[in-house]
Amino acid sequence: QAEESPFVGNPGNITGARGLTGTLRCQLQVQGEPPEVHWLRDGQILELADSTQTQVPLGEDEQDDWIVVSQLRITSLQLSDTGQYQCLVFLGHQTFVSQPGYVGLEGLPYFLEEPEDRTVAANTPFNLSCQAQGPPEPVDLLWLQDAVPLATAPGHGPQRSLHVPGLNKTSSFSCEAHNAKGVTTSRTATITVLPQQPRNLHLVSRQPTELEVAWTPGLSGIYPLTHCTLQAVLSDDGMGIQAGEPDPPEEPLTSQASVPPHQLRLGSLHPHTPYHIRVACTSSQGPSSWTHWLPVETPEGVPLGPPENISATRNGSQAFVHWQEPRAPLQGTLLGYRLAYQGQDTPEVLMDIGLRQEVTLELQGDGSVSNLTVCVAAYTAAGDGPWSLPVPLEAWRPGQAQPVHQLVKEPSTPAFSWPHHHHHHHHHH
């Protein structure tokens, strides 16, 4: 049969609220060298126990009896500390355990999860969470909105999760946890009601350097919208936007619109350029979320200036004209040049030169027409830019370079058909 247990004092019981500090103690009397005392909780050796061991000899000789006291300190009682505690010693080839002591937790409910502050769009459903535990169990929850209970009694309404179908004003929520020991109240969460995301962002009109856009505002609860903010960003390098990144790859152009109307003219844009735009609207509570980026493009414009450095020289029945691209912005893709020449008493001749910047003209007759002048204009798909001032044809002087070009015969009668959006020049010779 087993030897008698050396334990003369066993751990007591501790029951208290979270945070309590307490000590468990066991005492044994042994003969010879005192053993190390280990502590068990629910059968598991406590490897990092905050324990102290005191040994007192009862006689002069080492082989006499010793009193050994081990104390286990529980510094701040938590649920994980609860269970059955025993002391364990190894004496010779035998193992001894003390009678058990019990550590229990009992107090006001303890929150594992509390409602968090958040922002929600007006009239949009959302959930809040609250979770509490004892012991003692059960723990019943009662939700409050703006300090008003949402159920007749604890445990009767929603418990861990509160579903709110939507709010039209900023509100506060908290939950009460009730158990046999009393009531604990959670933190109060503020739910801020922001405007809904605007809808239907679209283009109203386009100009080469400006876009007019409009949108439909979302609901904003009891808080009127104060303004809307529109952002535009060049999308040449806007790969991030296409990939749905939340922020543009470069500093956006930001404009504010008073509302109503929910419309804004965005100026100072580059012509014939792709942009991405988005809008958010703000109330006294804060801004809505941004709309998705909308790809838009400014249309082409006509060149803003005439071709430069026009030179026109005449040699008998031929005239050589050359020029350079306009210095002013083209506002689009240059499609070519138009040239007009006119004598003092002859009708004006209009020609489409294409993208060449020089032309040799075959003049009618013997070249005796007097006071010949030439004008040149650049054009894009949007139409003609301004015509240059008339340049008189100077007589060719020997020594001047005269490049050889394919001759352009003057038609017997100028018959040009212009698209309706191309405007005719109105220069006077």
């Epitope: 087993a2 247990s5 068990l40 059968g43 490897e47 059955q84 355990v97 058990p100």
Partner: antibody, heavy 116, light 106 residues
Framework: QVQLVQSGAEVKKPGASVKVSCKAS????????INWVRQAPGQGLEWMGW????????KYNEKFKGRVTMTRDTSISTAYMELSRLRSDDTAVYYC?????????WGQGTLVTVSS | EIVLTQSPATLSLSPGERATLSCSAS?????MYWYQQKPGQAPRLLIY???NLASGIPARFSGSGSGTDFTLTISSLEPEDFAVYYC?????????FGQGTKLEIK
């Protein structure tokens, strides 16, 4: 000396239950935890849970919760392990073992075969 | 749960040789325990609290290690030592065992 003696081998059909006993002697039965550990053929060891005979408190491995029940009869120093809804993969040797933070004494094992 | 990995899976040695068995834990633990199991028998405790020899176990068995790496050493193998050896932890629940190292005669 400490001894743990288990009941004999069992053959069960899938869906049935089995109850294995473990009789302790040579030490104060109510002071030490009795654990149950199983070993499938050619496999390693798997802890199933414990019972503290002094109070009847139990702790089960999550894997077996809902299927295992551990009880004891202190008057005859015997612990029991019942496993229900048996499946073919429950075929194993079931050991009881005394524990003091580890398993210092073991029963001889009980072979439970689950076969249709 | 803490996973214990034993190496090697099989160790082939001759009587009189020194055997070194390793056990690695997936996270740090305080104590390791070692068991010996022979065919048709229950496991038997060899080492407790990492380095303490259990009752009736010959002194040629020793245990060491800390943190995640632990070792069982048999200084000079006897014929009766050829068996399967398991390491075990109970630093966290549930207690778990290694998959075993089979020590066989070369």
């Amino acid at each position: 000396q400490v001894q743990l003696v288990q009941s004999g081998a069992e053959v069960k059909k899938p869906g049935a239950s089995v109850k294995v006993s473990c009789k302790a002697s040579g030490y104060p039965f109510t002071d030490f935890y009795i654990n149950w550990v199983r070993q499938a053929p050619g496999q390693g060891l798997e802890w199933m849970g414990w019972i503290y005979p002094g109070s009847g408190n139990t702790k089960y491995n999550e894997k077996f919760k809902g299927r295992v029940t551990m009880t004891r009869d202190t008057s005859i120093s015997t612990a029991y392990m019942e496993l229900s809804r048996l499946r073919s993969d429950d075929t194993a040797v079931y050991y009881c073992a005394r524990s003091t933070g580890f398993f210092d004494y073991w029963g001889q094992g009980t072979l439970v075969t689950v076969s249709s | 749960e803490i996973v214990l990995t034993q190496s090697p899976a099989t160790l082939s040695l001759s009587p009189g040789e020194r055997a070194t068995l390793s056990c690695s834990a997936s996270s740090s633990i305080g104590y390791m325990y070692w068991y010996q199991q022979k065919p048709g028998q229950a496991p038997r405790l060899l080492i407790y609290l990492t380095s303490n020899l259990a009752s009736g176990i010959p002194a040629r068995f020793s245990g060491s290690g800390s943190g995640t790496d632990f070792t069982l050493t048999i200084s000079s193998l006897e014929p009766e030592d050829f068996a399967v050896y398991y390491c075990q932890q109970w630093s966290s629940n549930p207690p778990t065992f290694g998959q075993g190292t089979k020590l066989e005669i070369k």
